[in-house]
């Protein structure tokens, strides 16, 4: 596809045609309730075709859904926000000019969300090592439909002991999600000391349940750099 739009020569009359079938390959859209859905039918033709939308074979009108829908003609797209079960069905774009007509149908299924305890992505947070004075970042990727509460916790010592009289470990909450906490899924540690070494726990809870995963921080003396390639990144799977 050309990087930018070029008006067709007015002499080259042409029936509508698809300009980007890649964006039309996914015909079945299973979308969680309350999400946004977007259907696209990028097309060309001369004169420039018009686009209209049908739902289950009938003209799709704004009043057919609460909140209506958005059509961006320049992007050949239909957008529905905050989908609900009644939005389920077949959506057909009809693209036409005086020389012809083409159409493409999408099927929308709206999946009702069933509440579950938080799910944490496997492998995160990941073990890390750095030298004294270095910076490090732990990332915890959370999947939760219900509002999750994220806590970063570290085992600490009190009076030289890791455990209290009740046999439970001493824990310190380093960061938690809330009004004053930006991006609670990331715990950044700056200018670390040897005392920062140890286990870091990402604990996430919602009203259904909780989950936690942990990672270890190894702090090396300044002269002994970590044995890995020089790379700065946020873990991505």
């Amino acid at each position: 596809m050309a990087e930018d739009f070029v008006s067709e020569n007015s002499n080259n009359k042409r029936a509508p045609y698809w300009t980007n079938t890649e964006k039309m390959e996914k015909r079945l859209h299973a979308v969680p309730a309350a999400n946004t859905v977007k259907f696209r039918c990028p097309a060309g033709g001369n004169p420039m075709p018009t686009m209209r939308w049908l739902k289950n074979g009938k003209e799709f009108k704004q009043e057919h859904r609460i909140g209506g829908y958005k059509v961006r003609n320049q992007h050949w797209s239909l957008i529905m926000e905050s989908v609900v079960p009644s939005d389920k069905g077949n959506y057909t774009c009809v693209v036409e000019n005086e020389y012809g007509s083409i159409n493409h149908t999408y099927h929308l299924d709206v999946v009702e969300r069933s509440p579950h305890r938080p799910i944490l992505q496997a492998g995160l947070p990941a073990n890390a090592s750095t030298v004294v004075g270095g910076d490090v970042e732990f990332v915890c990727k959370v999947y939760s439909d219900a509002q999750p509460h994220i806590q970063w916790i570290k085992h600490v010592e009190k009076n030289g002991s890791k455990y209290g009289p009740d046999g439970l470990p001493y824990l310190k909450v380093l960061k938690h999600s809330g009004i004053n906490s930006s991006n609670a899924e990331v715990l950044a540690l700056f200018n670390v000391t040897e005392a920062d070494a140890g286990e870091y726990i990402c604990k996430v809870s919602n009203y259904i349940g909780q989950a936690n995963q942990s990672a270890w921080l190894t702090v090396l003396p300044k002269q002994q750099a970590p044995g890995r390639e020089k790379e700065h990144h946020h873990h991505h799977h």
Partner: antibody, heavy 119, light 107 residues
Framework: QVQLLESGGGLVQPGGSLRLSCAAS????????MSWVRQAPGKGLEWVSV????????HYADSVKGRFTISRDNSKNTLYLQMNSLRAEDTAVYYC????????????WGQGTLVTVSS | DIQMTQSPSSLSASVGDRVTITCRAS??????LNWYQQKPGKAPKLLIY???NLQSGVPSRFSGSGSGTDFTLTISSLQPEDFAVYYC?????????FGQGTKVEIK
């Protein structure tokens, strides 16, 4: 070459109004959707509003809905943002930006105009 | 609205480093994601559009990948002129929300 030049920024009192303009040149203005994006001092980018090339479609960020109006005059190659009921939190540099065709990526930006809302 | 979360919020790196910034959407946004670079006092500059397409004139050391909810911007070998703030932006929903930005600083 493509050029976008914003104007109309300045100091305004809370509750006041201001109209920003963006003069476009170097491309067929009516072929492109245009957006306004703002950036409060020391903060990140916030998309404000969009208008389709022929003016048939507009949309606004929730934070400005009902207070700001985007429009365009294709005969003058100019984009506008009418800002009413201004608040302190509207203080920002306002950029106009051109959307790439078939995508909502902003491929050309103006230099920005500063709007300060303060009593 | 669709929320965009960038990680990390800042990072320190050296010239020649490989740098990766990630962006996560609160719902599936297909490949409707763009990346921008912004230097102090300047307007943002488009680097990558639709998740993986390099904008004309942008050096090939910049690349983008991902689809659905997870996206990555990679700078294969950081150059002095690359120290800046990077933003992702989704254009799947009508409100084209940006991520909060990632500041790439000199180590």
């Amino acid at each position: 070459q493509v050029q976008l030049l914003e104007s109309g920024g300045g100091l305004v009192q809370p509750g006041g109004s201001l109209r920003l303009s963006c003069a476009a040149s170097g491309f067929t203005f009516s072929d492109y959707a245009m957006s306004w994006v703002r950036q409060a001092p020391g903060k990140g980018l916030e998309w404000v509003s969009v208008i389709e090339g022929d003016g048939s479609y507009t949309h606004y960020a929730d934070s400005v809905k009902g207070r700001f109006t985007i429009s365009r005059d294709n005969s003058k190659n100019t984009l506008y943002l009418q800002m009413n009921s201004l608040r302190a939190e509207d203080t920002a540099v306002y950029y106009c930006a051109r959307e790439k065709t078939y995508s909502s990526a902003f491929d050309y930006w103006g230099q920005g105009t500063l709007v300060t809302v303060s009593s | 609205d669709i929320q965009m979360t960038q990680s990390p919020s800042s990072l320190s790196a050296s010239v020649g480093d490989r740098v990766t910034i990630t962006c996560r959407a609160s719902q599936d946004i297909s490949s409707d994601l763009n990346w921008y670079q912004q230097k102090p006092g300047k307007a943002p500059k488009l680097l990558i559009y639709d998740a993986s397409n390099l904008q004309s004139g942008v050096p090939s050391r910049f690349s983008g990948s991902g689809s659905g909810t997870d996206f990555t911007l990679t700078i294969s070998s950081l150059q002095p002129e690359d120290f800046a703030v990077y933003y992702c932006q989704q254009h799947y929903s009508p409100s084209h929300t940006f991520g909060q930005g990632t500041k790439v600083e000199i180590k």
